[in-house]
């Protein structure tokens, strides 16, 4: 077939409207300036155009900002974006956080895509820190977006972030994450009264030390189970029987149901038998009486 | 996304034809879909268009004569064609947006299409 170059006579488009749904692919080519197109973006978005038309236009609008789209493009891009590829996005400079939403409201309900990761990247590398609006955003898009992070990237989330976190967008944070997370917590919320401050806390404590578990354990908190189980094994260990017993107040119980899983059962190992028979559930494995327990890390540090 | 179409067929100058596309997978009721057709020799053209918020548009030719038309319940589109004229001899093909959940890219799906001879 004879390659179509030249807009047949009456077709030039004039504005960017309806009209244009119904021009062949190469009609688009021809007959719409990519300047005209750049300057009505925000009228695309309400065109009904298949993704084979948006192709011919995001190419013209590649012909025109061969070095990446201005941000007043960007902001307009609606379906568009969806054509767009991690190295076009790579090339843009994305400041407002208006643009930032527009474009997750387009992918809004989908996976995060590369592209979607590419965007919040610039975006925030833009900005050069996590700062709460940015945070507020994307975790309303997606919740599970901090835990995507490295514990690098997290350190550049300033604690006054951290109040727009949810306990839904740590489930899928590992412990190296939240080491990083649970200092900037206690620091934000740090002027709360006890009960109030557990309620924020909870959710990071998956990152706290054995120093910060026992001040609680004076606090009559009363922590479920389902935090208990997530608290690292290692600031667990060296918590007495007692100090457990307060920290978790009635939810104590729940302890012999989760007795063959980490950290309970590393912990029991660590107990002496006496005291875990203190508590009338009858934990098992404990540290027979009259055996000597010997710390062998403290030993070694010594000589 | 799979489109499947029927209702084609042979049908005097003159006379109707609705035409159905069939739709199963991923979110058919979040995007725009519509009607294409190819007559034989001819370029590929659109003959409707209904978008995901249920407004239609028509091609000159067709306008006041066909009507485009999804019922989300059934996952179905439909395209009621009157006053049809032999020069509307084509295959129809039903087309929607989609997602590439894999790749993260917006697409087209189309169908297999559907024959409309009109003598």
């Known amino acids: 077939e004879v390659e179509k170059t030249a807009c047949p006579s009456g077709k030039k488009a004039r504005e960017i409207d309806e009209s244009l749904i119904f021009y062949k692919k190469w009609e688009l080519e021809a007959c719409v300036d990519a300047a005209l197109l750049a300057t009505q973006m925000d009228r695309v978005n309400a065109i009904p155009f298949t993704y084979e038309q948006l192709d011919v236009l995001k190419h013209k609008l590649d012909e025109l900002y061969p070095q990446g789209y201005p941000e007043s493009v960007i902001q307009h891009l609606g379906y568009l974006f969806l054509k767009m590829s991690p190295e076009d996005i790579r090339k843009w400079n994305v400041t407002s956080l208006e643009t930032l939403k527009a474009l997750l409201e387009v992918n809004k309900g989908h996976e995060m895509s590369p592209q979607v990761a590419t965007l919040i990247d610039r975006f925030v590398k833009g900005r050069g820190q996590l700062d709460k609006d940015t945070l507020d955003t994307l975790t309303a898009f997606y919740p599970g977006y901090l835990c995507s992070l490295s514990p690098e990237e997290l350190s550049s989330v300033p604690p006054s972030s951290i109040w727009a976190v949810r306990p839904q967008d740590l489930d899928t944070c590992d412990p190296r994450q939240l080491d990083v997370l649970y200092p900037k917590a206690r620091l934000a919320f740090q002027n709360m009264n006890g009960s109030e401050y557990f309620v924020k806390i909870q959710s990071f404590l998956g990152g706290a030390p054995t120093e910060d578990l026992k001040a609680l354990s004076q606090q009559n908190v009363s922590m479920d189970l389902a935090t208990f189980m997530k608290l690292r094994t290692d600031a667990v260990l060296p918590l007495t029987v007692a100090e457990v017993q307060k920290l978790l107040g009635p939810h104590v119980e729940g302890l012999k149901a989760e007795e063959r899983h980490r950290p309970v059962r590393d912990w029991i190992l660590r107990q002496r038998q006496d005291d875990l028979d203190t508590l009338g559930l009858g934990l098992q494995g404990g540290i027979p009486n009259g055996y000597l327990v010997l710390d062998l890390s403290m030993q070694e540090a010594l000589s | 996304v799979q489109l499947v179409e029927s209702g084609g067929g042979l049908v005097q100058a003159g006379g109707s034809l609705r035409l159905s596309c069939a739709a199963s997978?991923?979110?058919?009721?979040?995007?725009?879909m519509g009607w294409h057709r190819q007559a034989p020799g001819k370029e590929r053209e659109l003959v409707a268009v209904?978008?995901?918020?249920?407004?239609?548009y028509y091609a000159d030719s067709v306008k006041g004569r066909f009507t485009i038309s999804r019922d989300y319940s059934k996952n179905t589109l439909y395209l009621q064609m009157n006053s049809l004229k032999p020069e509307e001899t084509a295959v129809y093909y039903c087309?929607?947006?989609?997602?590439?959940?894999?790749?993260?890219?917006?697409?087209?799906?189309w169908g297999q299409g559907t024959s409309v001879t009109v003598s």
């Open positions: 209904i978008s995901s918020g249920g407004s239609t």
């Open positions: 997978g991923r979110t058919f009721s979040s995007y725009n």
């Open positions: 087309y929607a947006q989609g997602y590439d959940y894999d790749e993260g890219y917006g697409m087209d799906y």
